[in-house]
């Protein structure tokens, strides 16, 4: 004979445990009903009638299949350095994210608690490391024969122009000015226009909170800005 | 320029622990992170972690982390890579590399060897 | 991980030839690929950064491109000391890795 299928509330037999999506309550002894996911428990489950469910109400949330008597509260609106990644709904929590130009410097258990802009590099810095979400850039200087002209929390150093005839040296912060004769670049033309954002601090930037979107690159201008980091190794 | 001088080759036993150096010299070594590159004989090049000395932050490979350790020492620009619980597939070359805001590893140690031999 | 493979594994090309060397990401790494030279018992040194960009001092017969997934390292014409390893490395995400290497050998 099939066993017979047992409709909550039942007690369990000895030694057993309750099946999916139900729960036991000490108090009835009994194998009772979770609610589901944007629902909480009004009415806990007696020896002879079911758990009775209720929907959550405004601004709360329930996840997972429960029993609890009142719904979770959602998160407090995102601040104005934040984006709503996930509004808050009676099955979900909100989730606030750092916008673009800011990276996660205090996480909570679902997106982020406080967010930080990232930090530019200064002239003469490049960034060797990118910003990610939750990690600010690290900035560092110029290896010799390369240059970084701008503030950016994007952009890399790249080489100095080679001049026939030099007019002024480049150094870190200032490409080489060639004379009247065209000058050869050290890389391939339209190259490296690069989107952002792992990892540190350094002593030579100021972090401020206006994302950087660098400029198209020009390699035939001696002054042009640096070509930006892309998003590069995340944690 | 900068240069990055490591320190000599070592001969370990299985389970032994291996501490290289890496002393970076014409620059400081807060201009630079510093990178550490595994090389198994005949082998290609596998990345370990990298350190900022500025700061010692550190970032591993997920494959050596339980057993590598990056440290930087500022006053003497020196950077260690210290690898634990040595196993044969350890011999390898190791290089220390450092990069600046160019976001590449523009200059490379000479290389250290390490044999692990019962 | 992302899985980084050049081809061929072994070039032979005569000197003053072009040799063409293709390093594909398993995912795409945008334009976070270096380019590396390496001789026997010597380092690696840097040839080309952020996919395009050729390093201080690289002479200008080397030159790289691509993005996303597919990039590509040219020696437009070979001189005697290009023979070498060379090696590709995306640094778009952690781990950072390589892949395994062309050689180039003389024709």
């Known amino acids: 004979l099939p066993a017979q299928v047992a409709f909550t509330p039942y007690a369990p037999e000895p030694g057993s445990t309750c099946r999916l999506r139900e729960y036991y309550d000490q108090t009835a002894q009994m194998c009772c009903s979770k609610c589901s996911p944007g629902q909480h428990a009004k009415v806990f489950c007696t020896k002879t009638s079911d758990t009775v469910c209720d929907s959550c109400e405004d601004s709360t949330y329930t996840q997972l299949w429960n029993w609890v008597p009142e719904c979770l509260s959602c998160g407090s609106r995102c601040s104005s350095d934040q984006v709503e990644t996930q509004a808050c709904t009676r099955e979900q929590n909100r989730i606030c994210t750092c916008r673009p130009g800011w990276y996660c410097a205090l996480s909570k258990q679902e997106g982020c608690r406080l967010c930080a802009p990232l930090r530019k590099c200064r002239p003469g810095f490049g960034v060797a490391r990118p910003g990610t979400e939750t990690s600010d850039v690290v900035c560092k200087p110029c290896a010799p024969g390369t240059f970084s002209n701008t503030t950016s929390s994007t952009d890399i150093c790249r080489p100095h122009q080679i001049c026939n005839v030099v007019a002024i040296p480049g150094n870190a912060s200032m490409d080489a000015v060639c004379t009247s004769t065209s000058p050869t670049r050290s890389m391939a033309p339209g190259a490296v226009h690069l989107p952002q954002p792992v990892s540190t601090r350094s002593q030579h930037t100021q972090p401020t909170p206006e994302p950087s979107t660098a400029p198209s690159t020009s390699f035939l201008l001696p002054m042009g800005p640096s070509p930006p980091a892309e998003g590069s190794t995340g944690d | 320029e900068v240069q990055l001088v490591q320190s000599g080759a070592e001969v370990k036993k299985p389970g032994a622990t291996v501490k290289i150096s890496c002393k970076v010299s014409g620059y400081s070594i807060t201009d630079y992170l510093l990178h550490w590159v595994q090389q198994a004989p005949g082998k290609g090049l596998e990345w370990m972690g990298w350190i900022d000395p500025e700061d010692a932050k550190t970032k591993y490979g997920q494959k050596f982390q339980s057993r590598v350790t990056i440290t930087a020492d500022t006053s003497t620009d020196t950077a260690y890579m210290e690898l634990s619980s040595l196993r044969s597939e350890d011999t390898a070359v190791y290089y220390c590399a450092a990069q600046s805001g160019t976001g590449t590893m523009d200059a490379w140690g000479q290389g250290t060897l390490v044999t692990v031999s019962s | 991980d992302i899985v980084m493979t050049q081809s061929p594994a072994t070039l032979s090309v005569s000197p003053g030839e072009r040799a063409t060397l293709s390093c594909k990401a398993s995912?795409?790494?945008?334009?976070?690929v270096d380019w590396y030279q390496q001789k026997p018992g010597q380092s690696p040194r840097v040839l080309i950064y952020k996919a395009s960009i050729r390093y201080t001092g690289i002479p200008a017969r080397f030159s790289g491109s691509g993005s996303g997934t597919e990039f590509t390292l040219t020696i437009s014409i070979l001189q005697s000391e290009d023979f070498a390893v060379y090696f590709c490395?995306?640094?778009?995400?952690?781990?950072?890795?390589f892949g395994q290497g062309t050689k180039l050998e003389i024709k």
């Open positions: 995912q795409n790494v945008g334009s976070n």
């Open positions: 490395m995306q640094s778009k995400s952690y781990p950072i890795t």
